[in-house]
């Protein structure tokens, strides 16, 4: 229903922390550089004009949009030009251009310092001086670098955050009592970014409708005991939730999210047996626990598919009736039948079936033509399936890192014009699948490595995309979203490449690596192996095995060393020539 | 919403002519095959003959394979059945449908072959 102030019926049915949390999300979001500060003090301003029309929803300026009221607050920030540039242009129009500028100057790669933990005792001191003012340090920190981040899961991530801190900080040994559960909280979080910005992607590339596929696949695998009318509705909701999500109306979304979770926890009967646990949960854990709910068992007596989508004599009538219905009617009958494939092969399923049938209701005898459609299914399912049995297999014999490096190889050779940072990242991302996924059941395996591998891959199109310089690169991210993984695993050496020339410089080092923590190292390391590779982009395995040996042995003997600069200096260039010949 | 309205139907005398029309509408007519089947008083349907969406392809029943053309004009939206050397047996509900299709989504023309 409508509402005479917007922002008074936010403010009333969101509560004043989750209101003030998100609003500062939002601005974090759109404004990624300005401070903790000065974010702060507009969050306050609008949470006192909240209040105003909560008192008296016909005071001046209640009934402006939201967009209007804080697109007219970013706008009234000092130095907008001198510090944003074109962004500033933006203020120049009106709404909804203004609010759709903004959200195209959002930056996936801001130039910010990596987001440091402060060590356990300093880190706890101020956690007690004032949790609600460290607690906003966390929500600006992750929001400004993460400008998709989906709104309502970061207050989840904040809540964690605030009971890690409440339980570690009473303890004698915080620093051990914090660190892994920390770290646990980052690794989760910074997942649900890249998943998130894959969701932003679908919807900004290729609409509410690609979404909304999306959507019925991973519902009906969840839900498979859930009827197709339920499955839409569930579908049109979620879309709506994450539109306004990826749009920047965070208060909005979280609103209609807690709506979507009351709904499902009203409606367990017509949805599944496994949500109770998340419904007795206060409401950002249940709407966390119910995005990642177990799936509820297949019912046990479904008939075959081919009965209604190959069979049945109204194939085609049907299909002429009501396109995207009967599509989406066999993207739910196959979802739910497969828990234990990834939405997108699910979905390049359901492509490959619209395909056919576009072609064969066309002809005059449709049914000889799309008898076999299912039979032609079969390549496209053995292709991820061998894609995880390898990546696996290959991950259980070199471990995370070893793994990471041969991902690194791999997509060097593939896109050796990308810059290296990037490739590293990448990697390391890649790489960290199998940690994450060749550890699951073997049923689990599949949706969780491709579906991972897909988020990744949308997060290095996104940074290609600011400076496109591999057309290989172009060509996979300038397809459909669910032909972008299978595009990158087919892509081979980049024969087009012209080698770097070996610059000793690149491969010199001192001994402040020595000092690095661990990750820092291996970046180091991987850093120079993709620099090797686009040096020498047809190197065989051996050749590079050999070499980064070599130079690990290098590390190792000179950070022990008494005069490890010495060290350093003399045993460095002799590593390079060792390392010029072995690639020779 | 689908539509399909056939047309053409009547009495006709053993050996004469009769063309029947389907005027369709609700789907882009030009992407399906369509087809026309019959059903005889008392009998079930029987697939009379269907054509390609282009309209290059056609396919026709045994019975009535020389004396029956199928036709489409995809810029009117319409199917048609030319009949020509009619026979008793060809007496029935005529249906226009989609190409693979055995079933009546539409009212149907009665063709009646007798002297």
């Known amino acids: 229903e409508a509402h005479k102030s917007e922002i008074a019926h936010r403010y009333n049915d969101l509560g004043e922390q989750h209101f003030k949390g998100l609003v500062l999300i939002a601005f974090s979001q759109y404004l990624q550089k300005c401070s903790y500060d000065e974010h702060a003090k507009l969050v306050q301003e609008v949470t006192d004009f909240a209040k105003t029309c909560v008192a008296d929803e016909s005071a001046a300026n209640c009934d402006k949009s939201l967009h209007t009221l804080f697109g007219d607050k970013l706008c009234a920030i000092p130095n907008l030009r001198e510090n944003y540039g074109e962004l500033a242009d933006c203020c120049t129009k009106q709404e909804p251009e203004r609010n759709e500028c903004f959200l195209q100057h959002k930056d996936d790669n801001p130039s910010l310092p990596p987001f440091e933990r402060p060590e356990a005792e300093a880190m706890c001191t101020s956690f007690k001086e004032n949790p609600t003012t460290f607690m906003g340090h966390y929500l600006h920190e992750v929001a400004r670098r993460h400008p998709y981040f989906y709104a309502p899961e970061l207050l989840y991530y904040a809540e964690q955050y605030n009971e890690i801190l409440t339980q570690c900080c009473a303890e004698a040994d915080k620093e051990s009592c914090l660190t892994p559960k920390l770290d646990g909280v980052k690794e989760k979080a910074l997942v649900s970014s890249v998943r998130q910005r894959m969701k932003c992607s679908s919807m900004q590339k290729f609409g509410e409708r690609a979404f909304k596929a999306w959507a019925v696949a991973r519902l009906s695998q969840t839900f498979p005991n859930a009827d197709f009318a339920e499955i839409t509705k569930l579908a049109t909701d979620l879309t709506k939730v994450n539109k306004e999500c990826c749009h920047g109306d965070l208060l909005e979304c979280a609103d209609d999210r807690a709506e979507l979770a009351k709904y499902m926890c009203e409606n367990q009967a017509t949805i599944s047996s496994k949500l109770q646990t998340c419904c007795d949960k206060p409401l950002l854990k249940k709407a966390h626990c119910l995005s990642e709910v177990e799936h509820d068992t297949m019912p046990a007596d479904l008939p075959a598919i081919a009965a209604d989508f190959v069979e049945d004599q109204e194939v085609c009538k049907n299909y002429a009736e009501a396109k995207d219905v009967f599509l989406g009617t066999f993207l739910y009958e196959y979802s739910r039948r497969h828990p234990d494939y990834s939405v997108s092969l699910l979905l390049r399923l359901a492509k490959k079936y619209e395909a056919t049938l576009e072609k064969c209701c066309a002809e005059a005898n449709p049914p000889a033509c799309y008898g076999t459609v299912l039979a032609e299914f079969q390549p496209l399912v053995e292709e991820p399936k061998n894609l995880v049995k390898t990546n696996c297999d290959l991950y259980e014999k070199l471990g995370e890192y070893g793994f990471q490096n041969a991902i690194l190889v791999r997509y060097t050779q593939k896109a050796p014009q990308v810059s290296t940072p990037t490739l590293v990242e990448a990697a390391r991302n890649l790489g960290r699948v199998g940690t994450k996924c060749c550890t699951l059941p073997e049923d689990q395996r599949l949706p969780c490595v491709e579906d991972y591998l897909s988020a990744i891959l949308n997060r290095v199109c996104l940074l290609h995309e600011k400076t496109p310089v591999s057309e290989h690169v172009t060509k996979c991210c300038s397809g459909s979203l669910v032909e972008r993984r299978p595009c990158f695993s087919a892509l081979t050496v980049d024969e087009t490449y012209v080698p770097k020339e070996f610059k000793a410089e690149t491969f010199t080092f001192h001994s402040d690596i020595c000092t690095l923590p661990e990750k820092e190292k291996q970046i180091k390391k991987q850093t120079a192996l993709a620099e090797l590779v686009k040096h020498k982009p047809k190197a065989t395995a051996e050749q590079l095995k050999t070499v980064m040996d070599d130079f690990a042995q290098f590390l190792d003997t000179c950070c022990k060393a008494a005069d490890k600069d010495t060290c350093f200096s003399t045993e460095g260039p002799n590593l390079v020539t060792r390392c010029k010949d072995a690639l020779a | 919403k689908v539509q399909l309205v056939e047309s053409g139907g009547g009495l006709v005398q053993p050996g004469n002519s009769l063309r029947l029309s389907c005027a369709a509408s609700?789907?882009?007519?030009?992407?399906?095959?369509m087809g026309w089947v019959r059903q005889a008083p008392g009998k079930g349907l029987e697939w009379v003959s269907s054509?390609?969406?282009?309209?290059?392809?056609?396919l026709y029943a045994p019975s009535v394979k020389g004396r029956f053309t199928i036709s489409r004009d995809n810029s009117k939206n319409t199917l048609y059945l030319q009949m020509n050397s009619l026979r008793p047996e060809d007496t029935a509900v005529y249906y226009c449908?989609?190409?693979?299709?055995?079933?009546?989504s539409s009212q149907g023309t009665l063709v009646t072959v007798s002297s």
């Open positions: 609700g789907f882009t007519f030009s992407s399906f095959g």
């Open positions: 054509i390609s969406g282009s309209g290059s392809d056609t």
């Open positions: 449908t989609f190409a693979g299709s055995l079933s009546r």
